[in-house]
Amino acid sequence: HTAAQDNCTCPTNKMTVCSPDGPGGRCQCRALGSGMAVDCSTLTSKCLLLKARMSAPKNARTLVRPSEHALVDNDGLYDPDCDPEGRFKARQCNQTSVCWCVNSVGVRRTDKGDLSLRCDELVRTHHILIDLRHRPTAGAFNHSDLDAELRRLFRERYRLHPKFVAAVHYEQPTIQIELRQNTSQKAAGDVDIGDAAYYFERDIKGESLFQGRGGLDLRVRGEPLQVERTLIYYLDEIPPKFSMKRLTHHHHHHHHHH
C-alpha cells in the first residue's frame, strides 16, 4: 500500500482517494465505491475498478434504456460484489434479487436465476483473446515489430509477465493478442490477465485508469496504431453453463466495443 509517498497518489489507479493514514503512517489509497485499500505498485483488480466506475457521479442517466433483449453488449457494466481481496465473488446479484455466476473477469457464465442459485467456486478465465481492428494505414505493419510493441506494452505498462502473452497474430487490419494464464501458472504478485486486459480495454477506449499519465499512444516504428474496433473473448477453465437455447446463439463470452 505504499504509493508515491511524497504526494500520496496512486499511479496505477486514478479512481482512488489517497491519504497518509495507512499502516505505519504510509500513504493509503482507497478505491472509490468499495473503500478497499489498493496496492498502487500494481494494477487494481477489475472488480474494484468496476465498483469504482459504478459509484462515480452519473453524468448522463436521462437517456432511454434499451430493451433487455437488445443485442448490443452493455460493456459488462454492473455494480459487482468483490471479495475481501478485491476479486469477483462467484455469485453476483442485482437489486431485484436476480443472481448469476461469473468467472474471474466478472463475465456472466450461467443463466440468470434467483437467490437460490449456487455458484460453488469462482471459475478462472485462463485464456483471453483480444481481437482488434486497426484503422487503415499506408501499408500493413511489420508483424514482428507489431508483436514486439504489443508485448512491450503489456510488460511495461501493465506489468504482465511476458510468459502470459501467448501470441500476437496479425492479418491486416486484424490484430489478435492471446493472453493465457492457468491457475497453476499464476504466482503471488503476478498481474492477472483479466486485469491487464481490462486496463488495455480502457486504454484503447481513451479512458486510461492510470493517474496523470497521458492516454495510450501506440506506435509501431513511429506509425500510430489506432484501433477502431475491439472484441474480447474469454475462455474459462470450466466451460460455461448456459441453457441450450442460449448456446445456439452465443458461442463465446464476448464484449464488443466501438
Epitope: D21, G22, Q28, P84
Partner: antibody
Framework: QVQLVQSGAEVKKPGASVKVSCKAS????????IHWVRQAPGQGLEWIGT????????VYNQKFRDRATMTADTSISTAYIELSRLRSDDTAVYYC????????WGQGTTVTVSS | EIVLTQSPATLSLSPGERATLSCRAS??????IHWFQQKPGQSPRLLIK???ESISGIPSRFSGSGSGTDFTLTISSLEPEDFAVYYC?????????FGQGTKLEIK
Amino acid sequence: QVQLVQSGAEVKKPGASVKVSCKASGYSFTTHWIHWVRQAPGQGLEWIGTIFPSNAYAVYNQKFRDRATMTADTSISTAYIELSRLRSDDTAVYYCARASYFDYWGQGTTVTVSS
Amino acid sequence: EIVLTQSPATLSLSPGERATLSCRASQNIGTSIHWFQQKPGQSPRLLIKYASESISGIPSRFSGSGSGTDFTLTISSLEPEDFAVYYCQHSHSWPFTFGQGTKLEIK
C-alpha cells in the same frame, strides 16, 4: 496540536433538520478523511459516513444515505453534517473524527429530538 | 457489511490483573482493526491502530494482536483508570463498523 472542535448542543423537533460543524486545526485539513460517528444514550458507536475534504468525496452508511449530507469548507477547515427529517431515535451524541483509524475526535455534539 | 463481534460483553477483573478482549470479524480484514477506550461522558480514545501499532501517549500496558478475522486487545496489568468500555473498529472497506463494545468493570 491536532484539534477537532464541534458546535454546541441542539434541541430539535421531529421532522426538523440539524447541522453540526467540526472545525479542524493543527494539521492539513484537506489530506485526511473526516468521519462522523454517533452514539445514542447508553448505546455503542455507529458510523454515519466519511468525507475527504480536498475533493468532497463522501461515503455514507446505507442507513443514513437518504437523510445525511456531509460537506466540507476547506477555506475554514470545517466539516459539516446535516441530518434531515429528524426522529426521536436520532437523539445521540454526534462525533467527528479524523483519519481511517479515528486518531483524533471532537468533543461531541448532543442532539436531542423531542416534541 | 463487515460485522465485528466483541467478547465478552462484560469483563470483571481486579487491578493488577491481565485483561484479554476479543474482536472477531465476519470476513478477512487483514490488520485493518483499531481499538478504542471510552469513559462515561468522554469521546473515545484511540489505543491501538492496525491491529498492533502502538499510539503515542498510550501506556505500554496496552497491546494488540491478530490478523484476518481474530483480534485481541491485551492490558497487561490493569490500572484503576482502565475500567471503561472498549470498542474495536475496522477500516477494511466501506461501511466502517464498530464492535458492540466490551465493558471492563472492577471485580
